[in-house]
């Protein structure tokens, strides 16, 4: 504690001020990270702020334009690709959102040999998606649905597949299920390392059923949008696995990769695809009741001209207390023998931790062990293996950067990050060059986060690649909340959670508690992370008390607190936020009259369900576009944590996990409903079932609703929601406004 | 359409060698694999091994490893058997033939046959 | 290596009548795909002529009274109605593993 002259104090008190609802809405004390484009070992492609792309030498220290500015401003782009022979760049403009990851763009070619954009043969437009091969310069892209080669930018295309049909046939690129609950990609297509074959998949949507709404628009009829999305239960899509040479694309055509029997015997998914060499291949399936996935390693016959996936090199994970793997079934990273690989899945402790095979499953190595958990591999080299963790000082939401030596024997392991900037710098991200010689660390909080370049051999931090020095700046004069990550412990299950106080908070006196709630499976909400946002506001210029809490069902803390709520969602994760509260009120500072919760998406489920739990804790509480129904949500991740909704399988707790079956439970608070209309992932439809519930219970509740808007409510739809909860929270807390 | 023609017949003596060539047209001759099969005389079908002109990729029987080399020539379209250090039992008819892009290893067109006859 | 014995031996028929040749695996030529089993007809002094690949396709230009079935160890070369051209030694062939092997070949003479 530094003790200073009063009057200083004083001066430095008067200059200090709160944040404001306006610095968060414009985004004031946003943050930058820096993420290199690596090309090589040593080299990396930046946009710098003047937007040019500049290649950067780490070993020579210099740096020069590829692409100036001027050639981006001529087609408006917005993002680039250097092709690896470095002859090309695609630029990419006209950028419209489609899904969460999806988008449709203009693609124009620019060749650097001659500075000019190559003409003939150019690209169709709108392109769904567009990618370089990993060497030279051919472009594979997805057009209306299918696909199509170059073997050079200015040679005319082959089309691969023909069968692509909108919301019927997907080839290379996911349907909404796919891309939103399985992939996490825009794309469905493949190179191998040095883009002898293509693989990509193709999605059969013809049989699931359409959600279907109205976009308002501005004309006089509203348009009706229309996507195959099966909810849970629902028929899926069909996916098959096709490779083609690209050398010959036209000799054989596309080769289906045969689906292990064990999988294809009834309904399945293709989980991810993973090249090994150019002529081997790693794909993972999984069965549509998700608690068994196979990873099939498959082999290019140059005779049969197709792949041959022999049981031997099939690899099964099962999962006897939950689903599969944490959110996703981990994939595999291979050894430079293109044989073994490195894993991460649970041990017989029940901890997701990174395991070696070589040749079955049931002999795996075990590489990493603890009551804590790996979380990532990043890289695997010959002689190490990079991996982020949450071991360190034993906090869940922390994440550092690991390095274990796989040449030699006995692998010693070595903590790169926990060290360098320990009270900055807790939760960690890397980036590696090609065979790991360099790295980018990316440090996201506690403190203020900031980018650096390391040395692969020595980890030596080489410079600082950015610093949010205007950001630390512009803080200087802020009163910040204070920030704790604590537990607590109650029947045996260790709840973590994340308190943002007032800057003069005072343990002697009484705070209104607001809880910031998601829940989901597989999720983890109480992170060593830096954020200036609502609920900051909310506690440095309302004086409110914030508390994130990680419940059952979260992750990275073993299987037993993960696997809690499978095939009962809706119970914990709403009894451990309770308990949370009950806690909170012990402590002494809490107003127990003026306590809130509030949750987007899952957390909207959660909230609205301990509003309605009947403890009377909870004075008033806000839902944004939440789930009401598991039979309203997506099959793909429904089904994950909660089985069929089937008589035989688990209808019942589908049907008691509603909000509307506590419909009357409402009658005693105040509840705040928003969604957007034109949601395509929780659909509107979850919240109008809720209105219908509560009108006819005759329940007095609010509402808003944001006119074609979508599961983010964004633009200036985020402006009225943050403007509009902070009322609704400031009224419930008798707050002035 | 596809043809594949083979070199004349051949008279060796034991420990000699022969090369026998197999000229493609009709078809890319990069794209396909071409096989070479032996038939000795009143005898069934053996599969001596394969190479693949546009990946320069072989596979050889294991009891001919080492006395076997197979190669190719782009420019002519030609591909070549060579075998060392004959013996008697090499005498047979030998074939070469084109690998069926979707035949899954089946052998679509065959050369009419090289009759190599090893006797001292 | 896999081993594929061809039976009968010989088979002895008459012009019009059906022919049934069967080929045997020591071991599975078969993947969930597709069966690895080619068959081919030779007649003397003059190449094999693949007839089916992959168990069941008959390849173009050949006849409709050729068919092919069977998976796993077990194939079969069906010939519906025997033609007085049709009389020659038939070999199957695996493509499963390298090598590749043939039978020892049936030899449908005519009765």
């Known amino acids: 504690i530094v003790l200073r002259p009063s009057r200083v104090h004083n001066s430095e008190e008067n200059t200090m001020r709160a944040l404001t609802l306006k610095d968060i809405l414009n985004g004031t004390f946003s943050y930058k990270t820096f993420f290199p484009n690596w090309i090589s070992g040593q080299e990396y492609l930046h946009q710098s702020a003047d937007n040019n792309i500049v290649l950067y030498n780490i070993e020579t220290g210099q740096s020069y334009t590829i692409l100036s500015n001027r050639t981006m401003k001529s087609v408006n782009a917005s993002n680039y690709g250097l092709s690896p022979d470095r002859q090309f760049v695609y630029l990419e403009s006209d950028y419209s959102k489609l899904w969460r990851y999806s988008y449709t763009a203009t693609y124009y070619i620019y060749d650097l040999s001659n500075g000019e954009f190559v003409r003939g043969n150019e690209l169709p437009r709108p392109i769904q998606y567009l990618c370089w091969s990993p060497v030279g310069s051919k472009l594979a892209y997805v057009y209306q649905n299918n696909i199509y080669l170059k073997q050079r930018p200015g040679d005319p295309p082959f089309q691969i597949t023909f069968n692509g049909r909108e919301n019927k046939i997907f080839n290379g690129i996911p349907d909404w299920v796919y891309e939103e609950e399985m992939l996490a990609t825009k794309y469905a297509l493949w190179w191998s390392p040095n883009g002898k074959f293509l693989a990509y998949a193709e999605f059969n949507d013809t049989d699931i059923p359409v959600i279907a709404y109205s976009y308002y628009g501005d004309e006089q009829y509203p348009r009706t949008i229309n996507i195959p999305y099966p909810k849970a239960g629902a028929k899926n899509p069909v996916v098959r696995i096709f490779i083609i040479d690209t050398t010959y694309p036209a000799y054989v055509g596309p080769q289906e990769v045969p689906v292990p029997a064990m999988i294809a015997s009834s309904d399945y998914y293709f989980s991810w695809l993973t090249w090994v060499t150019d002529e081997r291949v790693c794909l993972q399936w999984l069965k549509r009741v998700q608690n068994v996935s196979v990873l099939s390693i498959c082999d290019f016959r140059e005779d049969w001209q197709t792949w041959d996936c022999p049981k031997t090199q099939e690899h099964i994970e099962e999962s006897r207390t939950g689903w599969a793997g944490g959110f996703f079934v981990s994939t595999p990273v291979f050894s430079y023998d293109a044989i073994s690989y490195y894993k991460i899945f649970s041990d017989k402790d029940g901890y997701k931790h990174i395991h070696y095979i070589k040749d079955t499953v049931e002999n795996a190595i075990q590489i990493t062990s603890g009551k804590w958990e790996a979380i990532n591999i990043f890289r695997v080299t010959q002689d190490s293996l990079f991996y982020s963790s949450n071991e360190f000082e034993e906090y869940p939401g922390r994440r550092n950067i690991y390095r274990i030596s796989i040449g030699s024997y006995p692998p010693s392991k070595k903590c790169v990050t926990c060290h360098l900037r320990k009270e900055r710098c807790q939760y960690y991200t890397a980036s590696f060059s090609d065979y790991a010689k360099y790295y980018a660390l990316v440090c996201y909080g506690p403190g203020i986060p900031i980018s650096t370049l390391h040395d692969g051999r020595t980890d030596q931090e080489i410079k600082i690649l950015e610093e949010n020095k205007e950001l630390e700046n512009a803080l200087k004069n802020i009163q910040l909340p204070k920030e704790e990550i604590k537990k607590l412990e109650v029947d045996e299950i260790t709840l973590w959670y994340k308190m943002i106080l007032p800057p003069q908070f005072d343990r002697s006196k009484k705070y209104p508690l607001l809880i910031q709630v998601y829940g989901g499976p597989c999720s983890q909400s109480v992170r060593s992370v830096f954020a200036v946002n609502w609920i900051s506001y909310l506690a440095s210029k309302e004086g409110m008390v914030i508390a994130l809490v990680d419940g059952r069902g979260t992750a990275f803390q073993g299987d037993k607190l993960l696997y809690a709520v499978y095939r009962k969602l809706g119970v914990y994760e709403v009894e451990d936020q309770i308990t949370a509260v009950r806690k909170f009120i012990e402590m002494g500072f809490i107003d127990e009259k003026r306590i809130a919760i509030w949750g987007w998406s899952y957390g909207g489920y959660v909230s609205s369900l301990a509003l309605a739990s009947g403890t009377g804790l909870f004075k008033c509480g806000i839902a944004v576009a939440p789930v009401s129904s598991w039979e309203y949500y997506a099959s793909v991740y429904t089904e994950r944590f909660m089985g069929l909704p089937t008589k035989d399988d688990n209808l019942e707790h589908y049907k008691n996990s509603t909000v509307m079956a506590r419909a009357e439970y409402f009658r005693n608070v105040d509840y705040l409903l928003i969604h957007g209309t034109a949601d395509d992932n929780v659909h509107f439809q979850n919240s109008a079932q809720i209105a219908k519930a509560l009108v006819n219970a005759q329940v007095d509740f609010q509402a808003m609703w944001y006119s074609d808007q979508n599961h983010g409510l964004s633009g200036l739809s985020t402006n009225h929601l943050y403007t509009h909860m902070t009322h609704f929270l400031k009224q419930c807390f008798s707050l002035s406004d | 359409q596809v043809q594949l023609v083979q070199s004349g017949a051949e008279v060796k003596k034991p420990g000699a060698s022969v090369k026998v060539s197999c000229k493609a047209s009709?078809?890319?001759?990069?794209?396909?694999?071409i096989h070479w099969v032996r038939q000795a005389p009143g005898q069934g079908l053996e599969w001596m091994g394969w190479?693949?002109?546009?990946?320069?990729?072989?596979k050889y029987a294991q009891k001919l490893q080492g006395r076997v080399t197979m190669t190719t020539d782009t420019s002519t379209s030609t591909a070549y058997m060579e075998l060392r250090s004959l013996r008697s039992d090499d005498t047979a008819v030998y074939y070469c033939?084109?690998?069926?892009?979707?035949?899954?290893?089946?052998?679509?067109?065959w050369g009419q046959g090289t009759l190599v006859t090893v006797s001292s | 290596e896999i081993v594929l014995t061809q039976s009968p031996g010989t088979l002895s028929l008459s012009p019009g009548e059906r022919a049934t040749l069967s080929c045997r695996a020591s071991?599975?030529?078969?993947?969930?795909?597709?069966?690895?089993m080619h068959w081919y007809q030779q007649k003397p002094g003059q190449a094999p002529r693949l007839l089916i690949y992959?168990?069941?396709n008959l390849e173009s230009g050949i006849p409709d009274r050729f068919s092919g079935s069977g998976s796993g160890t077990d194939f079969t070369l069906t010939i519906s109605r025997l033609e007085p051209e049709d009389f020659a030694v038939y070999y199957c062939?695996?493509?499963?593993?390298?090598?590749?092997?043939f039978g020892q070949g049936t030899k449908l003479e005519i009765k």
């Open positions: 033939a084109r690998h069926g892009g979707t035949g899954r290893g089946a052998m679509d067109y």
């Open positions: 009709g078809y890319t001759f990069t794209e396909a694999i």
């Open positions: 190479i693949h002109p546009g990946s320069g990729s072989i």
């Open positions: 071991q599975s030529v078969s993947t969930s795909a597709y069966s690895y």
């Open positions: 992959a168990a069941s």
């Open positions: 062939q695996q493509s499963r593993e390298l090598p590749y092997t």
